[in-house]
Interface confidence: low
């Protein structure tokens, strides 16, 4: 807390400029009018204030706006934003995407700080949903942003926003998140033709059910092994050898290298060995010829 002292004669700030960097903390407190600071916030960024001096400037704004800063001030905070606490930011009402971009720029290149996370949370809640422009902006600054949301939070993402998602934005998503995102992507891309649709939907297929994989196998998509290995095991297990062969196309050769890993390993265990042999890849571990396969899950469903 800076002690209240009278401003020395001739030191009253008429504008926010470089001369203020030579002011002591108490002089800044006494000689800079908070309303002047608020109207000239855009100048603060260009002046190399010390962290201690920034603390004083923040204190003056806090006194002027105890209920939270107006957006006109927030937009021009610049590196003073780094001095804000999540508690400060919770008082703000940020509605402009330009304001959000300006503040994200300050934190660019760093991990999402608690301040930034709170800012994004306030902004998204204010908008009511993660619209396309917001998602575009957030994933540009933080490619992992989408995968940092809980499945519950992802459920508020409208299908139209999915167009903004790039494959790298989904790199760190887990199956539960893809379960939520996949139906939205399917809806978003539903009017595209086969090959274009596959290019767009590919990154989301970790959330696809068996029936969609069966449908894709009829479309000559040539899924690569990296995508296949990210599919849900429970979605892959019911696929026949012929369906997997069609789904992977020329990439089917890669099954041999992955035969000990999920979901390939579990899928092999469910296939007849003579069906696997038709692939000519030397895949072993299928159900021996002559054995009867009982689908107990189907029997339970019927009883």
């Amino acid at each position: 807390e800076v002690e209240k002292t009278a401003c020395p004669s001739g030191k009253k700030a008429r504008e926010i400029d470089e001369s203020l960097i030579f002011y002591k903390k108490w002089e800044l407190e006494a000689c800079v009018d908070a309303a002047l600071l608020a109207t000239q916030m855009d100048r603060v960024n260009a002046i190399p204030f010390t962290y201690e001096q920034l603390d004083v400037l923040k204190h003056k704004l806090d006194e002027l706006y105890p209920q939270g800063y107006p957006e006109s001030v927030i937009q021009h905070l610049g590196y003073l934003f780094l001095k804000m606490s999540p508690e400060d930011i919770r008082k703000w009402n940020v509605t402009s995407l330009e304001t959000l971009k300006a503040l994200l720029e300050v934190n660019k290149g760093h991990e999402m700080s608690p301040q930034v996370a709170t800012l994004i949370d306030r902004f998204v809640k204010g908008r009511g949903q993660l619209d396309k422009d917001t998602l575009d902006t957030l994933t540009a600054f933080y490619p992992g942003y989408l995968c940092s949301l809980s499945p519950e939070e992802l459920s508020s993402v409208p299908p139209s926003s999915i167009w903004a998602v790039r494959p790298q934005d989904l790199d760190t998503c887990d199956p539960r998140q893809l379960d939520v995102l996949y139906p939205k992507a399917r809806l978003a891309f539903q009017n595209m033709n086969g090959s274009e649709y596959f290019v767009k939907i590919q990154s989301f297929l970790g959330g696809a059910p068996t029936e969609d994989l069966k449908a894709l196998s009829q479309q000559n998509v040539s899924m690569d092994l990296a995508t296949f290995m990210k599919l849900r095991t429970d979605a892959v297990l019911p696929l026949t050898v012929a369906e997997v062969q069609k789904l992977l196309g020329p990439h089917v050769e890669g099954l041999k290298a992955e035969e000990r890993h999920r979901p390939v390993r579990d899928w092999i265990l469910r296939q007849r060995q003579d069906d696997l042999d038709t692939l000519g890849l030397g895949l072993q571990g299928g159900i021996p010829n002559g054995y009867l396969v009982l689908d107990l899950s189907m029997q339970e469903a019927l009883s």
Partner: nanobody, 118 residues
């Protein structure tokens, strides 16, 4: 109620190693990111490592990159900080912290003292 309890601090010589542990209870760990912060006397809290609970995305500031490693065991609800090549400037109280995804670090442990001195 969320509880974070750190252990593993102590006195170590420069160049030595320590492994800090943080036991978490009272929440579904998968919905949280975890971090380690430190606070040296007279200084503010500094984030030294964080890890995303959905994946293994980690973050380290330049001051500890290559020396510190954060890891987690979701099943045991544990978070670890392996600190190698320790320096005198690493002396601080180290805090374990947790956050809900998309929010600031809101849950803190009591801290464990790490002193690097010969």
């Amino acid at each position: 109620e969320v509880q974070l309890v750190e252990s593993g601090g102590g006195l170590v010589q420069p160049g030595g190693s320590l492994r800090l542990s943080c036991a978490a209870s009272g929440f579904i760990s998968n919905f949280y990111a975890m971090g380690w912060f430190r606070q040296a006397p007279g200084k503010g809290r500094e984030l030294v490592a964080s890890i995303n609970s959905y994946s293994d995305i980690t973050y380290y500031p330049d001051s500890v990159e290559g020396r510190f490693t954060i890891s987690r065991d979701n099943a045991k609800r544990m978070v670890y900080l392996q600190m190698n090549s320790l320096r005198a400037e690493d002396t601080a109280v180290y805090y374990c912290a947790a956050r809900w995804q998309g929010q600031g670090f809101g849950y803190w442990g009591q801290g464990t003292q790490v002193t690097v001195s010969s």
